[in-house]
């Protein structure tokens, strides 16, 4: 829409058990979810390490200007771009019992908006138009959702590139270290 | 080195059992869920049936469910499969495989053992 | 048949970018992550990409996967000879409840 735009900041959205959507069917049963040896794997294994931070839901603040055809607004608007990763349910020691997560594949999580917000824009038109007022839908939150089939592409497109784009090489444990002794750590993080 | 290794498979008539043993080497045995998946020769993969960390959560594919029968002991490092009612169709490659990751995939992968179902 | 579709086939020269699709369905695609395997000829598989995306250590930057509604693809860029190999997706699928995986693509690096 040819608008400006430039990062003012981030604010990581790191999710809790009550963010999440209600479990599906297969989740009920926890028997053995609540085991310690949730978090990083010891130093012998074979996948490197990266920070849990670096798997998060991120609220990336942009400000951009409102356009409308020629028209542009008079004062830019500031507004949330959902962005990063929700990694695997591993790394959210708070949602282990909702899922059977020692599965090879399992829930699918994004990174999308959670809620909007209006707000009324004043438009400036050239050739002495006169100003004309809008209401433009703003992205307020982020949140990791489980993706359905009412997620579909098209509206991912809308929750920022991040959402959908491969990231390069990312992997979901914490620095290695012995997987009992990690617990405490990923609890206090969350 | 991190190491699976399958053994067990063999010649047998349709209707009687194999019990096939996977020994596990080089890493926290019990920091992998393990899975058994299989191959008929010239075809795909099939996923056959996981196990968790303590061996208390199980899952099977409908096409074994009620006849194989998916069980590890930590403390020999092993995996086991009980065929029973065996079919030809369960002629396969039998791969033992592990995942140490929730929702990451088969990281870990043996060579094999093949299992012929023949009269 | 297998509940993830996939080609038979595919190829391409040294070099070039290469991309496999696999399809499924609302209950495996749609709502799980997906994982792709290569089989090398007379070897097992390995793990390629995990969590739609994610490549595990030592999985050259060549390989990325990515994840559209109900479909999902592997892209191979800068082909090599020895990328020649059966490619497959795999998913969990919440009807079957099981862990399902395309037919497989068998990848040919002509020339």
């Known amino acids: 829409q040819g608008w400006q735009a430039f990062k003012n900041d981030a604010t990581e959205i790191i999710p809790e058990l009550g963010e999440y959507p209600e479990p599906p069917p297969e989740l009920e049963n926890n028997k053995t979810m609540n085991r310690a040896e949730n978090g990083g794997r010891p130093p012998h294994h074979p996948f490197e390490t990266k920070d849990v931070s670096e798997y998060s839901c991120r609220e990336l603040h942009f400000t951009r200007y409102v356009t409308d055809g020629p028209c542009r607004s008079a004062k830019p608007v500031t507004e949330l771009v959902c962005s990063g990763q929700c990694g695997p349910a591993r790394l959210l020691p708070n949602a282990i019992g909702r899922g059977k997560w020692w599965r090879p594949s399992g829930p699918d999580f994004r990174c999308i908006p959670d809620r909007y917000r209006a707000q009324r824009v004043q438009l400036l038109c050239p050739g002495g138009e006169a100003p004309r007022a809008r209401k433009v839908r703003l992205v307020a939150s982020c949140k990791c959702k489980r993706l359905t089939r009412f997620h579909n592409q098209s509206e991912l497109k809308d929750f920022g590139t991040e959402a959908a784009r491969p990231q390069k090489g990312r992997k979901p444990r914490p620095r290695a270290r012995s997987a009992k002794a990690n617990q405490a750590e990923l609890e206090n993080a969350y | 080195e991190v190491q699976l290794v399958e053994s067990g498979g063999g010649l047998v008539q349709p209707g009687r059992s194999l019990r096939l043993s996977c020994a596990a080497s080089?890493?926290?045995?019990?920091?992998?869920?393990l899975h058994w998946v299989r191959q008929a020769p010239g075809k795909g993969l099939e996923w056959v049936s996981g196990i968790n960390w303590e061996g208390d959560d199980i899952d099977y594919a409908d096409s074994v469910k009620g006849r194989f029968t998916i069980s590890r002991d930590n403390a020999k490092n092993s995996l086991y499969l009980q065929m029973n009612s065996l079919r030809v169709e369960d002629t396969a490659l039998y791969y033992c495989a592990g995942n140490s990751r929730g929702y990451g995939g088969l990281d870990v992968w043996g060579q094999g053992t093949t299992v012929t179902v023949s009269s | 048949q297998s509940v993830l579709t996939q080609p038979p086939s595919a190829s391409g020269t040294p070099g070039q970018r290469v991309t496999i699709s696999c399809s499924g369905s609302s209950s495996n695609i749609g709502r799980n992550t997906v994982n792709w395997y290569q089989q090398l000829p007379g070897t097992a598989p390995k793990l390629l990409i995990y969590s739609n995306n994610q490549r595990p250590s030592g999985v050259p930057d060549r390989f990325s996967g990515s994840k559209s509604g109900t479909s999902a693809s592997l892209a191979i860029s800068g082909l090599q000879s020895e990328d020649e190999a059966d490619y497959y997706c795999?998913?969990?699928?919440?009807?079957?409840?099981?862990?399902?995986f395309g037919g497989g693509t068998k990848l040919t690096v002509l020339g």
């Open positions: 795999a998913a969990w699928d919440d009807n079957l409840e099981s862990y399902v």
């Open positions: 080089g890493f926290t045995f019990d920091d992998y869920a």
